[in-house]
């Protein structure tokens, strides 16, 4: 997103800022994008390397078991409840994830794989 020129006299009362995304690797200097109405801004920011090491993923969820296959969409879903968030991460309290319905063997492998990611 490019930084848009702010029209004279227009005042943005509430900017919403996204996460700090390091320019290279998973920590260090990077950029954070902000939006306010039609305006966008990009500012320099820094993800301290010790924070990344301490926290890993920004948002960690505890997931329920996969629901039954929905024949009309060919997908199954499960809900996740927030377990832990990095201190400054604005995580959703609950999320819903879906995946295509597959044969039993494949489903078991995928579910196992996903479980560890909570």
């Amino acid at each position: 997103k490019k930084k848009e020129k702010v029209k004279k006299g227009s005042e943005c009362s509430e900017w919403t800022w996204g996460p700090c995304t390091p320019s290279s690797k998973d920590c260090g200097m990077g950029f954070r994008e902000g939006t306010c109405g039609a305006q966008t801004q990009r500012v320099h920011c820094k993800v301290p390397c010790n924070w990344k090491k301490e926290f890993g993923a920004d948002c960690k969820y505890k997931f329920e078991s996969w629901g039954a296959c929905d024949g009309s969409t060919g997908t199954k879903a499960r809900q996740g409840t927030l377990k832990k968030a990095r201190y400054n991460a604005q995580c959703q309290e609950t999320i819903r994830v879906t995946k295509p319905c597959t044969s039993k063997t494949k489903s078991k492998t995928k579910a196992k794989k996903g479980k560890g990611k909570d």
């Epitope: 009362s13 509430e14 900017w15 800022w17 700090c20 954070r32 902000g34 500012v43 320099h44 920011c45 820094k46 301290p48 924070w51 301490e54 409840t81 927030l82 377990k83 832990k84 968030a85 201190y87 400054n88 991460a89 604005q90 995580c91 959703q92 309290e93």
Partner: antibody
């Protein structure tokens, strides 16, 4: 919404110890960072440290590394602050607060600790 | 540690006037800056998070600006109940630190 009720404050002698409690009710206690902050009479706010109930990860202000211990009991939805080797300068109101970057925070009512002989 | 310097230490205004409170960080803290209001005998109350994000239940007259090193809390038209002490706090790095506070008093 989270409600935090604090207890355990009072008068303690220099060199003594005290355990403060912060009991949570309402939304899931275990998902959010619990901060401990203190405020000496007529002074500003000072951060002691924080703990995450889900795994007891603790981040302590180095100033308090030999003074404070943070713990949680998930079964009781309660966070604890253990203060040791108390001195007159530890006299303050101690607050707990539950932090979520998405929704903001909720604070306990505070509990006064007075260190005096 | 990051030092937050608030100014002025005391701000004397009449109800209806505009209040501008400043918080300066000793280094860039992106938008990881929060504003609290505290009244005597009460716990602090969060007014603004992440420099400019509003909080549910907080009147719209409170607004904040940032990010970087210079932050401002603005009260567009001060109400009698706004006279209190205001603190900024950073959550960019450990230890979390607070500014020394600005006391908003009745002129």
């Amino acid at each position: 919404q989270v409600q935090l009720v604090q207890s355990g404050g009072g008068l303690v002698q220099p060199g003594g110890s005290l355990r403060l409690s912060c009991a949570a009710s309402g939304q899931s206690f275990s998902s959010y960072w619990m901060n401990w902050v203190r405020q000496a009479p007529g002074q500003g706010l000072e951060w002691i440290g924080m703990i995450h109930p889900s795994d007891s990860e603790t981040i302590l202000n180095q100033k308090f590394k030999d003074k404070a211990t943070l713990t949680v009991d998930i079964s009781k939805n309660t966070a604890y602050l253990q203060m040791n080797s108390l001195r007159a300068e530890d006299t303050a109101v101690y607050y707990c607060s539950s932090w979520s970057a998405k929704r903001g925070d909720f604070w306990g009512q505070g509990t006064l600790v007075t260190v005096s002989s | 540690e990051i030092v937050l310097t608030q100014s002025p230490a005391t701000l004397s205004l009449s109800p209806g006037e505009r209040a501008t409170l400043s918080c300066r960080a000793s280094e860039s803290i992106s938008n990881n800056l929060h504003w609290y209001q505290q009244k005597p005998g009460q716990a602090p109350r969060l007014l603004i998070k992440y420099a400019s994000q509003s909080i549910s239940g907080i009147p719209a007259r409170f607004s904040g600006s940032g990010p970087g090193t210079d932050f401002t809390l603005t009260i567009s038209s001060v109400e009698p109940e706004d006279f209190a002490v205001y603190y900024c706090q950073q959550s960019n790095s450990w230890p979390l630190t607070f500014g020394g506070g600005t006391k908003l008093e009745i002129k």
